[in-house]
Every structure is written in structure tokens, then in C-alpha cells.
């Protein structure tokens, strides 16, 4: 039994490392945003025993603009985005709350970006696709970048290639 993709959270990203039952994953507030105190970025794949259907718990995460970054200018395009490490204490406690808000995700106010793809109109950088990989590590820690850029990458090819050593999870997206 596996979970479907977790829900989207405004101004946050998540890299799902496993869709397996009881997997725990963590949302990361976008650059220029920080976690609101008292909210939790954690989600867990759990089983609804009544329906025998797996689902992700709903995170209470709220990503709010970092007031300290409001008056800063965005970094120019084509710069190197460098990430420093900022510890973020977390736990899936009964209350679902974390001890304190995280430090800002970055010193840049940019939150959403778009990419121009040949043969298409301006489109958001987030789009559905397929395939998944089972991995073994679920422990993670939040890092923060010192710069970000005005453009980003987006996977647009439709072909799928999987070399030896990749472990399919068995989950398939429904779009």
C-alpha cells in the first residue's frame, strides 16, 4: 500500500523520498518565506483503517513572508544559488506542532518563478509527470540559500529512461 502524491502547500516545496506507508516527509518554505511559529511542516503516509486507503496527514504549515527580507532587492539573473545549512527542529508530536518557527528560507523575496519552454507560452515551473523512486533515507534537515535566480529549470521531455540500480516504488500518478 502506498500513498498518492501529498497535497500542495502555498509557498512551499516538498521532495517526496518515499510513498510507502508510514514514510515521513517535510515541506520546505520557499526562498523569502519562513515557517509561521506553531505550524508543522511534517506529513506522514498513514492508513485509513476504515477504507484501507493510504493518505498523507495534512500539515499545518503556513509559510509567511520573512519581514526581514521585504526591503531587499532580488538577486540578478544567472547567479549561483548557494545553500547554507539552517537546522530546523521537527517532530511529529501528538499536537502536530513544532517547537518554533524556522529561520528564513533565504534572503531573497522571490517565491515563484516561471520558465519559457520552446513551443509553449509562459508557464509555471511546476507541472505533472510520472515515475517514482524508492529510497532509504527519510531523515532530512533544512538548508537555506544566500541567493536565488530569476529563471529556473523545468523537466519538459516526455520520454522515460531508467538505468540499472533504480528502485521503482510502485506508485503511479493519476493526473
Amino acid at each position: 500500500i502506498t500513498c498518492p502524491p501529498p497535497m500542495s502547500v502555498e509557498h512551499a516545496d516538498i521532495w517526496v523520498k518515499s510513498y510507502s506507508l508510514y514514510s515521513r516527509e517535510r515541506y520546505i518554505c520557499n526562498s523569502g518565506f519562513k515557517r509561521k511559529a506553531g505550524t508543522s511542516s511534517l506529513t506522514e503516509c498513514v492508513l485509513n483503517k476504515a477504507t484501507n486507503v493510504a493518505h498523507w496527514t495534512t500539515p499545518s504549515l503556513k509559510c509567511i513572508r520573512d519581514p526581514a527580507l521585504v526591503h531587499q532587492r532580488p538577486a540578478p539573473p544567472s547567479t549561483v544559488t548557494t545553500a547554507g545549512v539552517t537546522p530546523q527542529p521537527e517532530s511529529l508530536s501528538p499536537s502536530g506542532k513544532e517547537p518554533a518557527a524556522s529561520s528564513p528560507s533565504s534572503n531573497n523575496t522571490a517565491a515563484t518563478t516561471a520558465a519559457i519552454v520552446p513551443g509553449s507560452q509562459l508557464m509555471p515551473s511546476k507541472s505533472p509527470s510520472t515515475g517514482t523512486t524508492e529510497i532509504s533515507s527519510h531523515e532530512s534537515s533544512h538548508g537555506t540559500p544566500s541567493q536565488t535566480t530569476a529563471k529556473n529549470w523545468e523537466l519538459t521531455a516526455s520520454a522515460s529512461h531508467q538505468p540499472p540500480g533504480v528502485y521503482p516504488q510502485g506508485h503511479s500518478d493519476t493526473t
Epitope: D13, V16, S106, T133, T144, T148, T149, N152, S160, Q162
Partner: nanobody, 122 residues
Framework: EVQLVESGGGLVQPGGSLRLSCVGS????????VGWYRQTPGKQREWVAV???????DYAGSVKGRFTISRDNAKNTVYLQMNSLKPEDTAVYYC????????????????WGQGTQVTVSS
């Protein structure tokens, strides 16, 4: 076809540093999130770090404070700076062109590079 090429691996002594590079190319190729993974013989591929389009990052607990992920969009390149290397960091390191299932929700795709070997030994 999406192609990923990793480089920068090698033999290093414990406590040393390496910087890995992952260059992406292909028709209309751009990535909203890029992850680094590593694998040792007989073990499952293990997630190491990710960098999202906004520039925010996340790390596995085993590498936090020692590894730094960054990206240069002008060069379609993602880097993994590895400091204070330990023998247990020995592995083949792969980058992955992540895909998006819901807005802001990403995971590993089936696009992998050939990997680059990192060996930490005295």
C-alpha cells in the same frame, strides 16, 4: 531526451572536500527541482540533498552541515559541495531531474546520470 552528466568524483582522504557537478541538457530541458542521491553496492539508492526552483534546499540528516547544494541556472548545472568527508560517504553519486506531481510537490524521476564515484579513504 533528457541527459544528466555528473562529474567531480574521486579519491579523497577523510576530512577532505570534493565538489560534484551535474549538468543537464536536452530539448527544452529545464528542471524545477534537482536532487542528489548516492548508492553503495548492495544497498538502496539514498537521497542526499535537493534544491528547488526558489532556491530553497533540503538535506539528509547524515550530511547536514557538511554538504551544500547549489545551482547555476545559466550553466544548467547543480553542484554538491562535500566537506569534512567520512569513509561512510563513499558511494556512487547521482543527480536526478525531479518531476512535479502537484504544484510544489516533487520526487525523483526516471532521469538519472551515469553517476560519479566518490571514495573516502586514507
Amino acid at each position: 531526451e533528457v541527459q544528466l552528466v555528473e562529474s567531480g568524483g574521486g579519491l579523497v582522504q577523510p576530512g577532505g572536500s570534493l565538489r560534484l557537478s551535474c549538468v543537464g541538457s536536452g530539448d527544452g530541458f529545464s528542471i524545477s527541482a534537482v536532487g542528489w542521491y548516492r548508492q553503495t553496492p548492495g544497498k538502496q539508492r539514498e537521497w542526499v540533498a535537493v534544491i528547488f526552483a526558489s532556491g530553497s534546499t533540503d538535506y539528509a540528516g547524515s550530511v547536514k552541515g557538511r554538504f551544500t547544494i547549489s545551482r547555476d541556472n545559466a550553466k544548467n548545472t547543480v553542484y554538491l559541495q562535500m566537506n569534512s568527508l567520512k569513509p561512510e560517504d563513499t558511494a556512487v553519486y547521482y543527480c536526478n531531474a525531479g518531476v512535479t506531481t502537484n504544484p510544489g510537490v516533487h520526487r525523483a524521476s526516471s532521469y538519472w546520470g551515469q553517476g560519479t564515484q566518490v571514495t573516502v579513504s586514507s
